[in-house]
Every structure is written in C-alpha cells, then in structure tokens.
Interface confidence: low
Amino acid sequence: IVLRPSRVHNSEENTMRALTLKDILNGTFSYKTFFPNWISGQEYLHQSADNNIVLYNIETGQSYTILSNRTMKSVNASNYGLSPDRQFVYLESDYSKLWRYSYTATYYIYDLSNGEFVRGNELPRPIQYLCWSPVGSKLAYVYQNNIYLKQRPGDPPFQITFNGRENKIFNGIPDWVYEEEMLATKYALWWSPNGKFLAYAEFNDTDIPVIAYSYYGDEQYPRTINIPYPKAGAKNPVVRIFIIDTTYPAYVGPQEVPVPAMIASSDYYFSWLTWVTDERVCLQWLKRVQNVSVLSICDFREDWQTWDCPKTQEHIEESRTGWAGGFFVSTPVFSYDAISYYKIFSDKDGYKHIHYIKDTVENAIQITSGKWEAINIFRVTQDSLFYSSNEFEEYPGRRNIYRISIGSYPPSKKCVTCHLRKERCQYYTASFSDYAKYYALVCYGPGIPISTLHDGRTDQEIKILEENKELENALKNIQLPKEEIKKLEVDEITLWYKMILPPQFDRSKKYPLLIQVYGGPCSQSVRSVFAVNWISYLASKEGMVIALVDGRGTAFQGDKLLYAVYRKLGVYEVEDQITAVRKFIEMGFIDEKRIAIWGWSYGGYVSSLALASGTGLFKCGIAVAPVSSWEYYASVYTERFMGLPTKDDNLEHYKNSTVMARAEYFRNVDYLLIHGTADDNVHFQNSAQIAKALVNAQVDFQAMWYSDQNHGLSGLSTNHLYTHMTHFLKQCFSLSD
C-alpha cells in the first residue's frame, strides 16, 4: 500500500476542511518544480521570482543577475535564451500558441557586452522557431516556413530554404502530424555539436487531405481553419532531411541525406536525428507500417561534400509482436568512441531494457534486465550511465534514478534515489550539467514535490532548490483523500490500480465509484505522483471513491501487456476496466447502483465503449473530446497500433471498434458528451458522429460543446467544464448540491 503523506497532523480536527471545487479551479494547491537551465558543468541560469535572470555557480557559491527584470519588461519578454559565448540573450515576447508544442513569437537580441538591444538587421516577426548554435552566437530561425541563418545577431540573414509555403512545405519545423505524433517538438532542425553543420527536415504536405473547421470568433462570418491532417490510411507528408555547412552556407548548399533502401521501398517516416560529432550524424527512420525502424549512421565525405550512410552502419529494430518501440522508437545515446551507443528496446523476454550496440543489433550487449523496464537514459559519461526505471520494489508506477558504472568490469549498479526520501519521493526525473558534474533531481511524489541539487561524482545532496513550503503550509488544514496503489491478478494479467478514498473512509460503508480512464497504448495512469485535482475534490468533499486502472495496452510492464491491444484497439482496454470494477464491487465498500466512468481523449473513447458494453455496471459516464472512430484520427498514431483501414489489412476492426456501432447500447445509461469545436487534434467530427448515431437510434443523451476551444478546453472553459461535470455526477449519484 502506498499511503500519501497527506499533511502534518493538526490536533484541532475541527479546523480541517474538505477541498472545494473552487480550490481546484483556482489552482490553490499547485506545486512548483526547479529545473536548472545548465550552461556549463557547474553553472546554471534561473528566472527568479521577481523575473531577473540569475546565473548560479555551484562551485564558488556565487550568483549574479545577467539580465534585469527591467530589461525583460521593456519588451514584455516571457522567455529568454543565452548564447553559448555568453555575449547575447534572445528575449521572447508576443507568444502566440499554435498546436501542442508550436507557437510563434517576436524575438529581440540583447547585447550583454554593451547593455543594448542589437539594432540593424532585426529579426522579422512573427518567428516560428529560433535557436542559438551550440558554440558561439550563430542564430538559426524559421520564418514563414523557411530557414534563415545569421553568423552574428547583427548580421544580415542568409536564407537557406526558399520553397517554404504555408500548409504546403515546412522547413525546419514539423507539420501538424509530425509535431503531435512523431517528433513531439516545435522544431525540426538540429545543430551539430560545434555548430559547423545544421540539419533540417523538409515536410511536403502538398498532397495531404485537409481538415477544415469553423472558428467562430467575433466576426460576422466565421473563419475556416485548414490543416493538412492525414487521417488513417490517407496520404502522408513526404519528408526529406538536408544538412548545410553553416560556415560556408552558399558553397554547396543543403545536401540531402539518403534514406535507407529498405525504408524507401514503401511509405516511411523520419523519426529523429541525433548528432554524434560534427561530421557524423544518426538518423532514425520508420516504415509506415511501424514495426520496422532503421537507425542509420551517416558520415560527411569531405571530398564530395556529401553525407554517406553505408549499409554497414544501418541498424534494424523490428517488432514481431507489435509496433517498434514504446510510444516512440527510443533514441540512441552515443558513447565517447562516437560509433557505439546505448539504446532501450525489448529484450528476449519482452521487457524494454538498455542495450549497448557496438557493431550490430544482433550482437547487442544487454545492460539492464529483469521483469521491469528501463525508461529513460539521461546521460552517458566516460565512466557512468544514468537512467530511470521502475525496478524498485516492483511498483511499475514509480521512477527511480540509477547509476551504472561502465568504466569498471563487471559494471556495478547503484540506485541514486531509492532511499533518499522514501515515503515522500518515489517518482523522479533528473537534469544533468555538462559531463554530469552536477545534477538536479525533481521528485513528483507521492508526497509534496521537491527539487534538489546533487554532486555528480558522489551523489551527495548539495542543496534544496524547491521544497514547496507554502504548499505544505496551505495543506495543513485540508482533509486530503487517502490514496493507495495496489494490484489485481486476473487471468494471468496484473491490473495495477490507484484508489482515491474519502478522508473518513470506512470499509463497512458503501460509496459511489468513479472510474477515471485514459487507457491509450503505452500510457500509464497509476503513478506514484502528487496531485490535488478534480478527483481529489470529488473524494474529499463529495465522498466518492475514484479508481484508475492500468489495463492491457499500458506501459512499462512488458510487451505482453503493451502489445496485447495491437490491431485491436477498443477491446481489451474496455474489458480490463470492467473486470476491475467487478473486483472493486467484491471488496464490499462500493455502491453498485452508483458507478460512473469518465475519460478525456483516448479515455473518452474507452469510457464511451465501457458505457456501451451492455454490462449494466455503469449508471452514467462522461466522454470529453473522445475519438469515436479510428478512421477519423491521425495516420501516424492510429496506424502504429491498428494497421491500415484497408480490406486486406485491418478495415474490419476499424469498423467494429467505433462508438457509433454501439449507439443502441447507450439506451440504459446517462451519457454526457463534451467536445471543443476547434479541436485540431481529435476533431469535433468524432463527437458529431456519436451524436448523430444516438439521434438516429433515438437514444437520449446530454451534450456540451465549447465554442472555439481546442483539445485542452482551457481558460474559462475549464471552470465551466468541471462545474458542469460535477453537477452531472452529483445528479447521477443523487448527491445534494
């Protein structure tokens, strides 16, 4: 059992109060983390509470302001970036969000040597992406889908690409589907380690079908938003990778990097680029049918000024039981010899582990092993490899940081975090300085989050960076719910669950149960992290039991569980939620006449299918921005797990797994369907089709749309949404207002 340390006990119980919905909507109990912005082995930058940019030197203990809040305020800057030679800072303002990661902004360059903004050859606006070279102060930026280079901030720009066109050709930035489903970044350009070369992707969306939706705004006529968006089976972007010498950019111009022949024989994706040295680069490619990935190491040919990718440097990663990788194919971390690398992929037992690849993948040396999974490689130094895993005490929802000594033989393993603050901290991430001289640990729970600074050689804690004291004090008089993480063993499947229980929970009483589900492939909901959110309020104030269950298809418990849903989305995820509910009823404290389920996005799909399962278990449920048919969702994501919606592939299951096909089954449940009309991700079309099917089947249901809101339903919509859902659930559970 994991009981979250909820508070420092106050002897005067009558001063304790339950959480309110207002607490949640106001973010009263939000926490802070501290991630140093490392600029060397022993120095980092941090934006202080009063908005000064401060440089800290760990070894001297000194700190000084490099940029005042007055300078920041003069251009309304919300972000900054120091050039590696420490001569200039870019200041970012006029932030304008586009999709999940992308945004445009105005950039000003501030010269630290003379305390003035750089005048002449100013940057155009708005810029889609801007970054310094890793050495010196060269600038690369993307404007109107084309890439530009400046040797110095005050110099005129050199235009690298000329074919950029809105919604057609994207240079140095991803199109919608690559941003959301493949790169998970706003950029698609990469400097070589010393800034000699700049690699970039070109995405050609000319032939991609366009999703169009109305944006109502305030005008007499709504605007139409058009996004090239490949749905399952549709034409995909065509990607090409180029590299340009930034020292003499006009000399030979951008050189295209060849695609491995076995990849190029059919539709494919580019998945990531990793520079190894200034003259060696590693590209990862993926077949459209995403069970084969190729890692290709390419070398610069000085004589031809081209990039050569010999077949002997192609490493194939293939899955015979599912798709390649976890959510994404893992990226390599190269060792100091600049050819061998460390990478996480499935071992022979079907668990994701770190492997060392020297020559071929077949001859890979397995570095970690066990019935748990390595999750992230943080840093490889000459003598150590730092990684995270969920090995400790066999809880898949934990994350601890480990160090493996690779300089000695046999390599020894040490858990850096397991015993630091064992009750408070079981879910960590880390951030390392150059050469791992120092690192920050950020603990997300289950107790109140805390960020600490450590010596990279001895692992000694140097200081606390952020301990959320104000939050701790604010929670002292709050009746937080209890949380427990346990597992159910059902038919050789382990179902981990998190149960959130009312503060005065009594096993002899009956409580309404709300299942919160996500359930998407390679996701994990049952995690040992701190949160005070809507479901905390529902348990604390409204006396509900809330449960989260990780069923088949979820991550970090081996390929058997993960790949169980391959080509069959919408089947086992739903079955496992239902199985868990039956087990919860058997525990004796659930009122089986008051059970609900809710989910957002993939969770909205699962909750809809669970409600329409015909089991009679659920009284009501909510689907927020659900997928309703996999034919409506993005190709890259959908086909990874479902194959293609073609007759000779998997069309039959595409058709069988829709929410619409089960419209009749909603007759005996109360269903609340919610969607934003400007959802660029899971299109409003999904809910429109559910509503149409329910109307055609003459099934009553409730619905709410949020005009001009995207997949996140942010701002005032958030308040309205949670208030609306609260009323719905309280009505369903016959709880008084």
Epitope: G233, A234, V238, S265, R288, L644, T646
Partner: antibody
Framework: EVQLVESGGGLVEPGGSLRLSCAAS????????MNWVRQAPGKGLEWVGR??????????DYAAPVRGRFSISRDDSKNTLFLEMNSLKTEDTAIYYC???????????????WGQGTLVTVSS | SYELTQPPSVSVSPGQTARITCSGD??????AYWYQQKPGQAPVLVIY???QRPSGIPERFSGSSSGTTVTLTISGVQAEDEADYYC???????????FGGGTKLTVL
C-alpha cells in the same frame, strides 16, 4: 544495370500447371517488393500478385481471379522470383511480366523496372 | 471491387495538350503511378506518386491530383508519345495493386 529476365512460359493445356521464374540483378533484391503483372493479347495490364520482403513478413497478396490457384515465392539467395500457376484456364493466356518499383529518396528517380515478359498460352 | 476508370481513347494533334484522367474512390488515400506502353514493349514509368517525374522522362509529362481523380498531362504532344497509358494505384501501404483499363493516345 538493373535487369529482370522472365522464363518458363509456353503452351499448356487447361487444368495444367506452369512455373515461371524471374531472375533479378543490378539491385538489392532482398529489399524489394516483387510483383507479377500479366497482359492478355490486345488487352490492358492486370496485376497478378506480389511478395513482400522478408523484413516486411514475406507475405503474398493476389488478385481475385488467381487467388487459390497461383502462388508467388522468392529465393533471396538466388535473386529469383517465382510464380507457380496451377489449374490454368484459357483466360490466363497472357504475357507475364515481373516488375519492381522502389521509390528511393524523393529527390532521386524511382527504381522502376520490368522484364521483357514471357508468354503463357493456355489452350487445348 | 475497387476499380480505376480511364477513358478508352484520347486523340490529339501534334503540339496540342493531351489530358488522360483516372478516377477511383481510393485515390484520395493512395498515390497514382502512370505507365506508358508502346506495342511489343514492356511498360515504362512516366509519373510516380501522382506528380513526380522519373529522370529521363521529358518535362512535357506531368501529373496532378484532385479528389478522386488523377490526371496525366502531356503538353506539346509529339508523334512518339502515341502509346497506351495506364494508371496504377499505389501499393506502398498494403493495398492491392490495381491498374486502370488503359487509354490509347492517338496523335493525329
């Protein structure tokens, strides 16, 4: 230089069998999806079937008129593609071509090659 | 079953522009390829992925795509362009390969 050379065609009676071969050279055969296409006298091109690479599962797909009667296989060590034809019908009379289309880097030309074809005549 | 529909014949005078269409319900999802076949010869690829031209194919050959129709355009037709032209749907993402019925281009 890429070459595809079909052989094994000839005259066969209805209900009979025939095995066609296609010898490939000049490219990495094991990386290519290989197809058979036929053309009846005076008619259009008709796809017969294809075999994927080993890395793509080595699976075969067939056009409806030949499914269950024809079988495609490959021998990557010998760079050879085969078409086993059983229960032949008069309407199977055609020139049979093997062909490969590999789209390489989008700035380059596709590798697209056909053999010269081999004539199969099914007649009593 | 899925079909690609082409006009049986198109006639055009030398120097004029010939347009050969090919329609099919799946063409919004699948690329089209165009082959030229002269009597007694194997087909030759003239357009791939709807609009790309292989090296060695004259610039007068171009391709376009709109909805369920793809079009092969030959501008400034020459006598040597007289041939049969076949469209083929892409097979790169596991659908079956399908050829259109072919269009005989006659240069008057």
């Amino acid at each position: 230089e890429v070459q595809l050379v079909e052989s094994g065609g000839g005259l066969v009676e209805p209900g009979g069998s025939l095995r066609l071969s296609c010898a490939a050279s000049g490219f990495t055969f094991s990386d290519a999806w290989m197809n058979w296409v036929r053309q009846a006298p005076g008619k259009g091109l008709e796809w017969v079937g294809r075999i994927k690479t080993k890395s793509d599962g080595g699976t075969t797909d067939y056009a409806a008129p030949v499914r269950g009667r024809f079988s495609i296989s490959r021998d990557d060590s010998k760079n050879t593609l085969f078409l086993e034809m059983n229960s032949l019908k008069t309407e199977d009379t055609a020139i049979y071509y093997c062909f490969i289309t590999v789209i390489v880097v989008s700035s380059e030309s596709p590798l697209d090659h056909w053999g010269q074809g081999t004539l199969v005549t099914v007649s009593s | 079953s899925y079909e690609l529909t082409q006009p049986p014949s198109v006639s055009v005078s030398p120097g004029q522009t010939a347009r050969i269409t090919c329609s099919g319900d799946e063409l919004p999802k699948q690329y089209a390829y165009w082959y030229q076949q002269k009597p007694g010869q194997a087909p030759v690829l003239v357009i791939y992925k709807d609009r790309q031209r292989p090296s060695g194919i004259p610039e007068r050959f171009s391709g376009s795509s709109s909805g369920t129709t793809v079009t092969l355009t030959i501008s400034g037709v020459q006598a040597e362009d007289e041939a049969d032209y076949y469209c083929q749907s892409a097979y790169s993402i596991n659908t079956y390969v399908i050829f259109g019925g072919g269009t005989k281009l006659t240069v008057l």
